[in-house]
């Protein structure tokens, strides 16, 4: 069964800077990635990002760096400045989109006792919804 | 709950212009769709896709509107446009906005799969 991953990090130099970082662990090719905050896109959540292999990756405030680590994994450098940055308790979703899977979504959030620059290495985040 | 409102529908004449304006809102959060498209119903006829628009900003227009009518999204994502010239008798109809998302992110055929919808303004082509 595909899963997806979820990591959040607060960057040590700049302690209202997040780093998101979100993987698909399954087979088929991903179409489409969403990055949202707040809560899952068009749920409660804002989207911050959207990664598509061949046309490209448009972001919004208060994200600054969106990017293809690998063909199945991304990440996402977030602003930390004015009343839209982040905070630590803040949920990040990824949802992914792959053929011939479907969508598969999941959130997380900075670990509570998280020290900056400090993360835990990448786990499965609880799936959150499979269309 | 995601609205959709409509605005920029009047009566203009033969050849004239509009320009028609669409605002995503959702409360507690900014939603910015995938796609988001205008539709039209003209008295007496079923509704028909006019103009699609997704997130990266790949158009598509019924063959009926192409070269007169143009379809725009704002940086921010959630505001759609539609620029109509050249307009003609045929083009008077109820103009809706629709959005929603599709898995790859580009518009669906037809408009399958926008589960919002506007409730339309009217533009009405007439000397």
């Known amino acids: 069964t595909p899963e997806v991953w979820v990591q959040v990090r607060m960057e040590a130099t700049e302690l209202s800077s997040f780093t998101i970082r979100c993987g698909f662990l399954g087979s088929g090719s991903i179409s489409l990635v969403t990055v949202s905050w707040g809560g899952p896109n068009g749920a409660g959540g804002t989207t911050l990002a959207v990664l598509h292999p061949e046309r490209g990756i448009r972001q919004w405030a208060p994200a600054r760096q969106a990017r293809w680590e690998t063909q199945s994994s991304i990440s996402l450098i977030l602003e930390g400045s004015g009343a839209s940055s982040p905070c630590a308790n803040t949920t990040f979703c990824c949802k992914f989109a792959s053929f011939p899977e479907g969508s598969w979504e999941a959130c997380g959030s900075l670990p509570p006792s998280s020290d900056p620059g400090l993360s835990a290495p990448p786990t499965p985040a609880p799936i959150l919804r499979a269309d | 709950q995601v609205q959709l409102v409509e605005s920029g529908g009047g009566l203009v004449q033969p050849g004239g212009s509009l320009r028609l304006s669409c605002v995503a809102s959702?409360?507690?959060?900014?939603?910015?769709?995938?796609?988001m498209a205008w539709f039209r119903q003209a008295p007496g006829k079923e509704r028909e896709a006019v103009a699609g628009?997704?997130?990266?900003?790949?158009?598509t227009y019924a063959d009926s509107v192409k070269g007169r009518f143009t379809a725009s999204r704002d940086n921010a994502g959630f505001s759609l446009y539609l620029q109509m010239n050249s307009l003609r008798a045929e083009d008077t109809a109820v103009y809706y906005c629709?959005?929603?998302?599709?898995?790859?992110?580009?518009?669906?055929?037809?408009?399958?799969?926008?589960?919002?919808w506007g409730q339309g303004t009217m533009v009405t082509v007439s000397s």
């Open positions: 629709a959005a929603g998302d599709s898995p790859d992110g580009r518009c669906p055929p037809l408009g399958q799969g926008l589960n919002y």
């Open positions: 959702a409360s507690g959060f900014t939603y910015r769709p995938y796609c």
């Open positions: 628009i997704d997130i990266f900003g790949g158009t």
